[in-house]
């Protein structure tokens, strides 16, 4: 039961995280005009990965796409790439994890296959989350650098008479969405990896032994002890089968014909 819950929760958390990464990537407010010196402005600027916007006091908003590819800063291109890689990996991870979910039956898919798929999707989610966090952090670092640079040359002009106020930019909402979403995707990926451990059938040499006691039908399944311990070599009445380590819910979900004697 715990494995199913962990896997399901991991999937849901990752789904929310990837939706957040997509939202952050599409958002226009990666950087917003710093209003520290002028808290009330008639023209408000904000920028995203794909376009920059200006919202006027009148309510009119004008957005212009970055129609050049070569003219853009390398850092911006890198951030775009990281976010897109994060989305692509996350989307593939989601697709894989859907088929890996324990609650979904697809043909006669082995538990080992589901475990592998869960692990694969978990790793994809982790990388996806890291890509998003890295992308957002690179952009944030770029903003901080530019902020202090523009603060240094805040006012330029002739004889201090005419002032050209340079617009400074600070963290926009998309950065926080990106960080949270990346973190959620990362957590979801870790949960999937944890769930995978519970799903994977361990390769052991353990033997489960069924004894026929006189008068009663008793099934004995050793849990974690070596099958040979204390039971010598009396093999007359015993049925021997490979008893791979299984989780509690697997025992409940898939009753074996050897469970009852």
């Amino acid at each position: 039961m715990a494995v199913t819950a962990c896997q399901g929760l991991g999937f849901v958390v990752s789904l929310i995280g990837i939706a957040g990464i997509i939202a952050a990537t599409c958002m226009d407010q990666w950087s917003t005009q710093d209003l520290y010196n002028n808290p009330v402005t008639a023209v408000f600027n904000y920028q995203g990965l794909w376009r920059s916007c200006v919202r006027e006091s009148s309510g009119f908003t004008e957005c212009r796409g970055y129609f050049t590819l070569l003219g853009l800063p390398a850092m911006l291109q890198a951030v775009r790439a990281l976010m897109i890689v994060g989305i692509v990996l996350g989307a593939i991870g989601l697709l894989v994890s859907i088929f890996a979910l324990k609650c979904i039956r697809i043909g006669s898919m082995e538990d080992s296959a589901k475990a592998n798929m869960t692990l694969t999707s978990g790793i994809m989610f982790i990388v996806s989350g890291l890509c998003a966090i890295a992308g957002v952090s690179v952009f944030a670092n770029m903003l901080v650098t530019n902020f202090w640079m523009s603060t240094a040359n805040m006012y330029t002009g002739m004889g201090g008479m005419v002032q050209t106020v340079q617009t400074r930019y600070t963290f926009g909402a998309a950065l926080f969405v990106g960080w949270v979403a990346g973190g959620l995707t990362l957590i979801g990926g870790v949960m999937m990896c944890i769930a995978c451990r519970g799903l994977a059938p361990e390769e052991t040499n353990y033997k489960a032994v069924s004894y026929h006691a006189s008068g009663h039908s008793v099934a004995y399944k050793p849990g974690g002890f070596k099958a040979s311990t204390g039971f010598g070599s009396n093999t007359k009445n015993k049925k021997i089968y490979d008893g791979g380590a299984r989780t509690e819910d697997e025992v409940q979900s898939y009753p074996s014909k050897h469970d009852y004697v």
Partner: antibody, heavy 118, light 113 residues
Framework: QVQLQQSGAELARPGASVKLSCKAS????????INWVKQKTGQGLEWIGE????????YYSEKFRGRATLTADKSSSTAYMEFRSLTSEDSAVYFC???????????WDQGTAVTVSS | DIVMTQSPSSLPVTAGEMVTMSCKSS????????????LTWYQQKPGQPPKLLIY???TRESGVPDRFTGSGSGTDFTLTISSVQAEDLAVYYC?????????FGGGTKLERK
């Protein structure tokens, strides 16, 4: 078409208050910001402040802050400007105007003349 | 506050001639976000409210004759009337529409020579 209709001329005593109204029609009232501008006879234009009818946000010129209060009534599509502690310096024509693209005031009413006299 | 200075304060003209009037701001009105200058020009005739002519320093309002042209960037702006008509005799105001408080220039009065 877009129209702004202001109340009639006002005569007030020094120290009194006046409340000017500006009724908008021909558009959705909450869509555009309304500005108020003062013009003394034979002089230039002076911005008083603006109100965003949708949320009620107001911005004032420091000179008029505290004496002018801008409000908007969405149900009647009317903007109001209340002016307190009137002096002879407040005798002027007051315009309301709609702010549009470029933060430009592109529709103006005919103006309301306020005369402060004892 | 941004101070707007218009010159000349009075401009005598004759019909058909080209006139230019100047407007200077104490701060740049150029917005880096969209590379637009937030300067507006209005025309006011006696007994009438002002009429919008030009916004974003050079964009003509619909219905405004194309003899009116706005130009300039940053802190220096110009309004040009290519061929003055009798109906153009009025006071012209420039306005900072970039920052609160919106401030107007003192006006340039276009009068018959």
């Amino acid at each position: 078409q877009v129209q702004l209709q202001q109340s009639g001329a006002e005569l007030a005593r020094p120290g009194a208050s006046v409340k000017l109204s500006c009724k908008a029609s021909g558009y959705t009232f909450t869509s555009y910001v309304i500005n108020w501008v003062k013009q003394k006879t034979g002089q230039g234009l002076e911005w008083i402040g603006e109100i965003h009818p949708r949320g009620g946000n107001t911005y004032y010129s420091e000179k008029f802050r505290g004496r002018a209060t801008l409000t908007a009534d969405k149900s009647s599509s009317t903007a109001y400007m209340e002016f307190r502690s009137l002096t002879s310096e407040d005798s002027a024509v007051y315009f309301c105007a709609i702010l549009r693209r470029g933060n430009a005031m592109d529709y103006w009413d005919q103006g309301t003349a306020v005369t402060v006299s004892s | 506050d941004i101070v707007m200075t218009q010159s000349p304060s009075s401009l005598p003209v004759t019909a058909g001639e080209m006139v230019t009037m100047s407007c200077k701001s104490s701060q740049s009105l150029l917005n880096s976000g969209n590379q637009r200058n937030y300067l507006t020009w209005y025309q006011q005739k006696p007994g009438q409210p002002p009429k919008l002519l030009i916004y974003w320093a050079s964009t003509r309002e619909s219905g405004v004759p194309d003899r009116f042209t706005g130009s300039g960037s940053g802190t220096d702006f110009t309004l040009t009337i290519s061929s003055v008509q009798a109906e153009d005799l009025a006071v012209y105001y420039c306005q900072n529409s970039y920052n609160y408080p919106y401030t107007f220039g003192g006006g340039t009065k276009l009068e018959r020579k």
